[in-house]
Interface confidence: low
Amino acid sequence: IQVMSQLSGRRVLVTGFPASLRLSEEELLDKLEIFFGKTRNGGGDVDVRELLPGSVMLGFARDGVAQRLCQIGQFTVPLGGQQVPLRVSPYVNGEIQ
């Protein structure tokens, strides 16, 4: 078994969600898309989003957005009435061969 991993140039992994967060899947994804969709937050147009265990993957329509967000690395995002500190890191595509 070989695990092939590849950095995705247009995707990021958002982590750090507290267990106390009271949002539905759709609400969480919508709020993250709105926040990271804003250029003033370093983001850009989101064209794919996926809820993963304890994290969210966001994909952007243009090159450079994911890299910029990963360079900043730390964001405090309004979610469910809280100011939630989140981390943004490169998204790694993995597949088992």
Epitope: G42, G73, T76, R87
Partner: antibody, heavy 117, light 107 residues
Framework: VQLVESGPELKKPGETVKISCKAS????????MNWVKQAPGKGLKWMGW????????TFADDFKGRFAFSLETSASTAYLQINNLKNEDTATYFC???????????WGQGTSVTVSS | DIVMTQSPAIMSASPGEKVTMTCSAS?????MHWYQQKSGTSPKRWIY???KLASGVPARFSGSGSGTSYSLTISSMEAEDAATYYC??????????FGAGTKLEIK
């Protein structure tokens, strides 16, 4: 949330000073830390910030060269080091946490550094 | 670099008077914040994201603006409001610059 800075320093020109900023009441690596200079009777001047998760520092143009930011993550502490001190480094230095919308939501009490021969 | 110009540099107001101070940016900014600092103490976040009041800030304070022009207003001046107020912008490069401050005194 509390940011507690180290005590006042009296130094001679050419010496080095290292100021600490100990954070408590939150997860240290979830928020970046800024450093801000205030010379006597003057306004606030942003020096830069350090990403407390990656350790990557970012410096304002006027603070590139003699200045260093560092972390001791296990102790939830950020440090500012100034090398080859000059008289114009005499100031109060504040650490301040990056918060919502990139505002500085919590500040240390400030550390006074006096450089005099 | 984005330059922040605060005006006036110094102003005084009588109790009950309405106070407005302004902050002008040399180019459009992403976020604007205001801090209050009293002599011998560290600054406090006062208004963030243009118009949101920080916890504990009296409702007589308000913030407004967009693009390059922003203001802080006190609807009815009180003695405890005497302080220096700094505006601060965040944009992508460099992330932060402060205005020179407006010193507000009580008459």
């Amino acid at each position: 949330v509390q940011l507690v800075e180290s005590g006042p320093e009296l130094k001679k020109p050419g010496e080095t000073v290292k100021i600490s900023c100990k954070a408590s009441g939150y997860t240290f690596t979830n928020y970046g830390m800024n450093w801000v200079k205030q010379a006597p009777g003057k306004g606030l001047k942003w020096m830069g910030w350090i990403n407390t998760y990656t350790g990557e520092p970012t410096f304002a143009d006027d603070f590139k060269g003699r200045f260093a930011f560092s972390l001791e993550t296990s102790a939830s502490t950020a440090y500012l080091q100034i090398n080859n001190l000059k008289n114009e480094d005499t100031a109060t230095y504040f650490c301040a946490r990056y918060g919502y919308s990139w505002a500085m939501d919590y500040w240390g009490q400030g550390t006074s550094v006096t450089v005099s021969s | 670099d984005i330059v922040m110009t605060q005006s006036p540099a110094i102003m005084s107001a009588s109790p009950g008077e309405k106070v407005t101070m302004t902050c002008s940016a040399s180019s459009s900014v992403s976020y604007m914040h205001w801090y209050q600092q009293k002599s011998g103490t560290s600054p406090k976040r006062w208004i963030y994201d243009t118009s949101k009041l920080a916890s504990g800030v009296p409702a007589r304070f308000s913030g407004s603006g967009s693009g390059t022009s922003y203001s802080l207003t006190i609807s009815s001046m009180e003695a405890e409001d005497a302080a220096t107020y700094y505006c601060q912008q965040w944009s992508s490069n460099p992330p932060i610059t402060f205005g020179a401050g407006t010193k507000l005194e009580i008459k």
